[in-house]
C-alpha cells in the first residue's frame, strides 16, 4: 500500500469568517493529522493517534516555528501581489511532502501556487526551481542562489520526510493499515421510458482506492458509463457508484466487477426473470460462487421498478485464504 | 482563476424510509477557499449542520464535507445550497436517493 505525508500552507490577502489569513494542515494519506491557523496560533493534532504519541514539547516547538512561517508566508504573498500589481483577494499556497511506495521506493515534492495556479516547483534531483512565469523567475533566481536551503530541502524530502511518515504510519497503523471491504449491491431502475439503468454501488470501504467496472457479456464497457467518484461517507469509510444504461429488451448479461485491496467481487445485474443470481469473490486462489438460495449474502428485492443484489463481505467465510 | 465547486449530495448508508441516516454534502474543486454551505429540508435551512475543516487538494483546490442527521421519507426533499465567488447565484443540488 502506498502512503503519503503532505503539509499544506495557505495565505489569503482577504480573510473571511471561515478562512483565516494563514492555515497550515498536515495529512497522512487522506487523514488530517495536524492543524495551525492565524486565529488559534497553536499547532494541534487532528488525529487521536497523533495526540497520543507526540509529547507537548513537539506541539510547542512547532507552534513557535509556525508562528514564524506564518509571518514569512504572509510577507511572500504581499511581495507577489506587489510584483503582479494585484489588490483584493489573492491566495498563496505551498505543498511539501513525500510518498512511500509499495515497492519501498520514495518520492518527494515541494511546490507553490499563486491564486490556485502552479507558481514554482522544486526539482530535488537537479536542485533547481521550475518557474511558471516572469514573477516566479525572480523567486527562482533568489532561491537557487541559496545552496544551503536547496540542500536542506532535498535532504528533508528524501530523508526526514520519509522518517516522519514512517513514524506516523506506526502511530496510526490501526487506522491507516486497516482494510474494510465494501458492501456491494446492484440495482435496476427505469430512469426514462424505454431506458433502464443498472447501478453498482459500493459503500463502507477503506482504503479509498477501488476499481469498479461494468461488463457486458464478459467485455468491459467504457462508454455509456456514469461514475460517481469515490466519496467520503463521513465515518472514515468511502462509497462509490457506477451506472450503465441499457435497452431493457436486450438479452445482454451485465455484471459489476469490483476489486478492493486484492479482493475481487462480481455481481450480476438483476434480471426480470431467472431465479439464480451470482456473486463471485476471488481472493488469492479462492473462488467463491454463492447461489441465492439460503445463503443470506444476496438480496433480491422487488420494489416498484427497483431490483437489488447485494454482497456483504463480512458475511462470507473465506477460510484461510489471504484477504 | 476561480474554480467552480462540484457538489454531491448523498447518504452515508443506503437510504431506507423511516430509518435514521446521515446526509452528506461533499463540496470539492473550488477556489478561492471562501465558501458558504447550507443544507435544506423541504427548502428550509437545516440548523444543525456539521462542517469538516477546510481541506486541501494536490491540484490547489479545496474541499469540505458538510453533514446532518436525517430520516428519509417518501415525501421530504433534501438539498445542499452553495454560495461561491465563481458563481453569480448560489447553486442548489437536490438529494437523489438513487445516486
Amino acid at each position: 500500500r502506498t502512503h503519503s505525508l503532505r503539509y499544506f500552507r495557505l495565505a489569503v490577502s482577504d480573510p473571511g469568517p471561515v478562512v483565516p489569513e494563514f492555515i497550515s494542515v498536515g495529512y497522512v494519506d487522506s487523514h488530517p493529522i495536524t492543524t495551525y491557523d492565524s486565529v488559534t496560533r497553536q499547532k494541534e493534532p487532528k488525529a487521536p493517534w497523533m495526540a497520543e504519541n507526540l509529547a507537548p514539547d513537539h506541539w510547542e516547538r512547532y507552534t513557535q516555528l509556525l508562528r514564524g512561517w506564518q509571518q514569512t508566508f504572509k510577507a511572500e504573498l504581499r511581495h507577489l501581489q506587489r510584483h503582479y500589481n494585484h489588490s483584493g483577494l489573492h491566495t498563496y499556497q505551498r505543498m511539501i511532502g513525500c510518498e512511500l511506495l509499495e515497492d519501498g521506493s520514495t518520492t518527494g515534492f515541494l511546490q507553490y501556487a499563486y491564486d490556485g495556479q502552479d507558481f514554482i516547483i522544486f526539482n530535488k534531483d537537479t536542485l533547481s526551481w521550475l518557474a511558471m512565469d516572469y514573477v516566479a523567475h525572480i523567486t527562482k533566481q533568489a532561491w537557487e542562489a541559496n545552496l544551503h536551503e536547496l540542500q536542506y530541502q532535498k535532504n528533508w524530502l528524501e530523508e526526514e520526510c520519509i522518517a516522519w511518515l514512517k513514524r506516523f504510519l506506526e502511530y496510526g497503523r490501526d487506522t491507516l493499515e486497516r482494510t474494510e471491504h465494501p458492501v456491494v449491491r446492484t440495482t435496476r431502475k427505469e430512469t426514462f421510458p424505454g431506458i433502464t439503468t443498472f447501478f453498482c454501488r459500493a459503500h463502507g470501504f477503506y482504503p479509498p482506492e477501488i476499481s469498479m467496472t461494468w461488463m457486458k457479456n464478459g467485455e468491459e464497457i467504457a462508454q455509456e458509463v456514469d461514475y460517481g467518484g469515490v466519496l467520503p461517507s463521513g465515518d472514515g469509510t468511502y462509497q462509490t457508484w457506477l451506472s450503465v444504461n441499457l435497452d431493457p429488451q436486450s438479452n445482454d448479461v451485465y455484471s459489476c466487477h469490483v476489486e478492493h485491496c486484492g479482493r475481487q467481487m462480481v455481481l450480476e445485474a438483476p434480471r426480470e426473470s431467472g431465479d439464480i443470481l451470482r456473486v463471485s469473490t476471488i481472493s488469492g486462489t479462492t473462488i467463491l460462487i454463492i447461489a441465492l438460495a439460503g445463503v443470506g449474502v444476496l438480496i433480491w428485492r422487488r420494489s416498484q421498478e427497483l431490483k437489488e443484489v447485494m454482497y456483504q463481505p463480512t458475511q462470507v467465510n473465506e477460510g484461510s485464504s489471504p484477504s | 482563476i476561480q474554480k467552480t465547486p462540484q457538489i454531491q449530495v448523498y447518504s452515508r448508508h443506503p437510504p431506507e424510509n423511516g430509518k435514521p441516516n446521515i446526509l452528506n454534502c461533499y463540496v470539492t474543486q473550488f477556489h478561492p477557499p471562501h465558501i458558504e454551505i447550507q443544507m435544506l429540508k423541504n427548502g428550509k435551512k437545516i440548523p444543525k449542520v456539521e462542517m469538516s475543516d477546510m481541506s486541501f487538494s494536490k491540484d490547489w483546490s479545496f474541499y469540505i464535507l458538510a453533514h446532518t442527521e436525517f430520516t428519509p421519507t417518501e415525501t421530504d426533499t433534501y438539498a445542499c445550497r452553495v454560495k461561491h465567488a465563481s458563481m453569480a447565484e448560489p447553486k442548489t443540488v437536490y438529494w437523489d436517493r438513487d445516486m
Partner: antibody, heavy 120, light 112 residues
Framework: QVQLQQSGTELVRPGTSVKVSCKAS????????IEWIKQRPGQGLEWIGV????????SYNEKFKGKATLTADKSSSTAYMQLSSLTSEDSAVYFC?????????????WGQGTSVTVSS | DVLMTQTPLSLPVSLGDQASISCRSS???????????LDWYLQKPGQSPKVLIY???NRFSGVPARFSGSGSGTDFTLKISRVEAEDLGVYYC?????????FGGGTKLEIK
C-alpha cells in the same frame, strides 16, 4: 574517516592564476556542498562561495565573482577553486569545507588550508 | 549582505571562569524554511576552524557540554561555562542563511 585533502603551498607571480584542489574521501562526495573560505594573515574568515558537486550548482560572494571559479569533478571526488589575475590582496590561506547532509547542517569537516603567496 | 557583528573583539578570562560571546546580525537570519543556519567555530593558531555549535544551539558531536549556544532572529550568544586551557583561540560566528554567507569578525579568547 572523512578527509578533505588540499593541495600544497603556492608561490605565484602577480597577474597569473592558480588552481587549488580539495580531494574528498570517506563519504559520498555528491551528498555534501563544498564551501571555500579565505583567511588573510592575521585576519578573519571570509566566505568565497559554495558548490554542489551533485548538481553543479554554484553560488558566489559577489566580491569574488570574476576572481574565483569553483568546479568539481565527481569521478575523482575533487573540488577546485581557480583564482585569476592575482594580486598581493589574494595572498592568503584558502580553506575548503564540506557543508551539511541531514542533521548536521554545518561545515563539519575542513581541509588543512592552502597557502597562496602572490609575489614578484 | 548580512553583517555579523561580534563582541567583544578580545575576551581575557581566567581558567574556570564563564565566558560569553555575542553575535548580532544586521537582519533576521531565519530562512523561509524556518531554519536559522547560525554556527560557532573555534580556530586555534595554525589550525583549521572547527565547528562547536550549529543551527544556533546544537552542539556538534564530540564538543564538550560546557559549550552552549542560544538566540534567535538577530541576536545570538555562545557561552562557555568553565573555560579550560584548550578553549583558547579565536571564535567566529557564521550565518549560512542568506547569500552571501558571512562570518563575524572573530573574538579572541585569551588568558587574563
Amino acid at each position: 574517516q572523512v578527509q578533505l585533502q588540499q593541495s600544497g603551498t603556492e608561490l605565484v607571480r602577480p597577474g597569473t592564476s592558480v588552481k587549488v584542489s580539495c580531494k574528498a574521501s570517506g563519504y559520498a562526495f555528491s551528498n555534501y556542498l563544498i564551501e571555500w573560505i579565505k583567511q588573510r594573515p592575521g585576519q578573519g574568515l571570509e566566505w568565497i562561495g559554495v558548490i554542489n558537486p551533485g548538481s553543479g550548482g554554484i553560488s558566489y560572494n559577489e566580491k569574488f565573482k570574476g576572481k574565483a571559479t569553483l568546479t568539481a569533478d565527481k569521478s575523482s571526488s575533487t573540488a577546485y577553486m581557480q583564482l585569476s589575475s592575482l594580486t598581493s590582496e589574494d595572498s592568503a590561506v584558502y580553506f575548503c569545507a564540506r557543508w551539511g547532509y541531514l542533521y548536521y547542517y554545518t561545515m563539519d569537516h575542513w581541509g588543512q588550508g592552502t597557502s597562496v603567496t602572490v609575489s614578484s | 549582505d548580512v553583517l555579523m557583528t561580534q563582541t567583544p573583539l578580545s575576551l581575557p578570562v581566567s581558567l574556570g571562569d564563564q565566558a560569553s560571546i555575542s553575535c548580532r546580525s544586521s537582519q533576521s537570519i531565519v530562512q523561509g524554511s524556518g531554519n536559522t543556519f547560525l554556527d560557532w567555530y573555534l580556530q586555534k593558531p595554525g589550525q583549521s576552524p572547527k565547528v562547536l555549535i550549529y543551527k544556533v544551539s546544537n552542539r556538534f558531536s564530540g564538543v564538550p557540554a560546557r559549550f552552549s549556544g542560544s538566540g534567535s532572529g538577530t541576536d545570538f550568544t555562545l557561552k562557555i561555562s568553565r573555560v579550560e586551557a584548550e578553549d583558547l583561540g579565536v571564535y567566529y560566528c557564521f550565518q549560512g542563511s542568506h547569500v552571501p554567507y558571512t562570518f563575524g569578525g572573530g573574538t579572541k579568547l585569551e588568558i587574563k
